[in-house]
């Protein structure tokens, strides 16, 4: 560092900034000798409102430094991000935001539940708000899934009105026929592949709606659609395997007692879905009377044996292997209760009986020419078989 | 030697959003410094909208917060303005630059204009 | 924010002549944290003066600059025809970093 040229003057002796310590410390500094500035942790080295990494100035011959002192300034992570559908709080003091301060972030209750972590942020010396995990991204509010106001009643024939709350996860599709959807998050909807075949060139022409009791109720949640997913394994008017879609909201909607996705269904769900187990179908689909029902209605029926309703749809007019493992079947053998043309996309549903949330076993699919026929069943798209298929649209869009 | 070079589309139609990209080469941009974006409306007056440092941190001009994002992609040495919901009075000429008062490091890439009209 | 006010907005100087231009903050500048800039029409702007008086690199020794607080000037000792161009000031003394409206040196 030291270059004597004893015809220069000396530049001004340097004073390290506070929090901060200067290097190396001479007696004098002459031309092109150097020092270099270092903060203290949890302090930066600042040159106005500019940061820098590193700071050394150099002595000119006119014994000026070549540039002006830093300051080190504690570091400031600045205002948290906002938590969608989630507050934040300060923990050290109202709005401290400098190294060392403490948030946390915690979800809306009820209806949110806060993944990834725990939600306590520290402001570190890098000047990014880091949880415990050394995540730097906020944490993010998932809806809960699966919570639904109904009591499991007793079954009327043909099926019921569905109150307030009951199906809050029921989605009407209309923009080509009347269908059905189960939301899933906040801003995706699962529905059947044929039910929104027509459209999947154009998705803004689905008219969603959400939180609808009444199929005709101007009291309702808006939704429009961003994307349309088809599972590529589907082809119209070719059976009906793979009879599975997905659709991508253009926004997320707001989750409350009349909006909660349902759930899907976790490794350990089949134990839920034997033969004879109970599901839910809802929709606003053709009752008896031969009309779309006015009402969202809802019908209990039982899982039916898988070989006994693939029996049942080889003889004629149904041609053999119309029935596959992607489907599973759900009835009354002697008829009379089953989902029927506009209830397409709805979602079966299930209780699990360890975490107490409705999860979705089966799409609406197809059935027999005549619902609720005997001797014939309601077939859904088996959505355990697809779920590597839904998490990876969802994760990559 | 450090060269800074923006590329964008040109014309953005009302209510859009414009996404610029400044391409550095001769310097890696989590080495030192702050990286900013300055725009010049037509009538010659410059802006300061913001800037992403070395570490990843970024400010942003008040005025322009709300509708901000700064971001960069270390890998391509390259840094990226977002400004949503734009009007015609976002019709400019944007400069990606470096400012600093280290002798001889400050920079600016030649500016790309960019019209808001439908 | 701290504005900057140039002045004058355009003038025009002949070869040789003596030229100053001030740039007036509505609050106090640290003298380190004022830059000056020159641009020409079709260029970016390039760093003409930094810590208020301290020369870029490649300006000519004609150039000078002053000031502390809130008053600041550039000048030119003798005018040149290569000075012909628009100056701005900059503070980055605090955020926002703000820009004079600049000052248009022309040639008589």
């Known amino acids: 560092h030291h270059h004597h040229h004893h015809a220069s003057q000396p530049c001004p002796y340097p004073m390290a900034p506070p929090n901060g310590h200067l290097s190396p410390v001479q007696a004098k500094y002459i031309l092109k000798d150097s020092f270099s500035i270092f903060c203290e942790p949890g302090y930066e080295l600042l040159q106005g409102h500019l940061p820098l990494k590193s700071f050394a100035a150099v002595c000119q011959k006119d014994g000026s430094w070549d540039q002006p002192m830093p300051s080190c300034s504690i570091v400031d992570c600045g205002p948290p991000d906002d938590l969608p559908s989630g507050r934040v709080e300060y923990i050290t003091g109202p709005e401290v935001t400098t190294y060392k301060a403490v948030i946390q972030y915690s979800c809306e209750e009820t209806f949110y539940t806060m993944k990834v972590n725990d939600g306590k942020y520290v402001c570190e010396a890098d000047g990014f708000w880091t949880s415990s995990k050394g995540e730097r991204s906020p944490p993010v509010c998932e809806p809960v899934c699966g919570l639904s106001a109904r009591t499991t009643g007793g079954r009327i024939y043909g099926g019921q009105k569905a109150k307030p709350g009951d199906f809050p996860w029921q989605v009407l599709i209309l923009g080509g026929s009347t269908a059905a959807g189960a939301l899933l998050y906040d801003n995706w909807v699962l529905t059947a592949a044929h039910a929104i075949y027509e459209q999947k060139h154009d998705a803004s022409s689905l008219d969603i709606r959400l939180g609808a009791l009444k199929r005709l109720s101007p009291h309702y949640t808006q939704a429009w659609a961003e994307a349309v997913f088809i599972h590529e394994g589907y082809t119209h008017d070719a059976g009906f395997d793979n009879d599975i879609a997905l659709i991508k909201l253009n926004n997320k909607v707001v989750i409350n007692s009349n909006i909660t996705p349902i759930c899907l269904p976790r490794k350990e769900a089949e134990s839920f879905m034997r033969t004879d187990d109970i599901g839910t179908a809802s929709g606003w689909g053709l009752t008896q009377r031969g009309l779309l029902a006015r009402n969202l209605m809802y019908v209990d029926i039982p899982i039916v044996d898988h070989q006994k309703c693939t029996a049942a749809y080889e003889k004629p007019p149904y041609s053999g292997g119309s029935v596959t493992a992607n489907m599973l079947c759900a009835g009354l053998e002697s008829g009379g209760k089953d989902s029927c043309r506009g209830d397409a996309g709805g979602a079966l549903v299930f209780l699990d009986n360890e975490t107490q949330r409705w999860f979705v076993g089966g799409i609406v699919s197809w059935g027999s020419m005549n619902c609720g026929e005997a001797g014939q069943y309601g077939v859904y798209t088996k959505v355990i078989n697809y779920i590597p298929w839904i998490k990876n649209i969802i994760s990559n869009f | 030697d450090v060269q800074l070079q923006e590329s964008g589309p040109g014309l953005v139609r009302p209510s859009q959003s414009l996404s610029l990209t400044c391409t550095v080469t001769?310097?890696?941009?989590?080495?030192?410094?702050?990286w900013n974006w300055i725009r010049q409306f037509p009538g010659n007056k410059l802006e300061w909208m913001g800037y992403?440092?070395?570490?990843?941190?970024?400010s942003y001009n008040p005025s322009l917060k709300s509708r901000l994002s700064i971001t960069r992609d270390t890998s391509k040495n390259q840094f990226f303005l977002q400004l949503n919901s734009v009007s015609s009075a976002d019709t400019a000429t944007y400069y990606c630059?470096?400012?600093?008062?280290?002798?001889?490091?400050?920079?600016w890439g030649q500016g790309t204009t960019l019209t808001v009209s439908s | 924010q701290t504005v900057l006010t140039q002045s004058p907005a355009i003038m025009s100087a002949s070869l040789g002549e003596r030229v100053t231009m001030t740039c007036t903050a509505s609050s106090s500048v640290s003298s380190s944290y004022l830059l000056w800039y020159q641009q020409k029409p079709g260029s970016s702007p390039k760093l003409w003066i930094y810590s208020t008086s301290k020369l870029a690199s490649g300006v000519p020794v004609r150039f000078s600059g002053s000031g502390s607080g809130t008053s600041y000037s550039l000048t030119i000792s003798s005018m040149e025809a290569d000075d012909a161009a628009t100056y701005y000031c900059?503070?980055?003394?605090?955020?926002?970093?703000?820009f004079g409206a600049g000052t248009k040196l022309e040639l008589k």
């Open positions: 001769g310097y890696s941009i989590t080495s030192d410094y702050a």
């Open positions: 630059a470096i400012i600093s008062t280290a002798v001889d490091f400050d920079y």
């Open positions: 992403i440092s070395y570490s990843g941190r970024t």
């Open positions: 900059l503070q980055y003394n605090r955020s926002p970093l703000t």
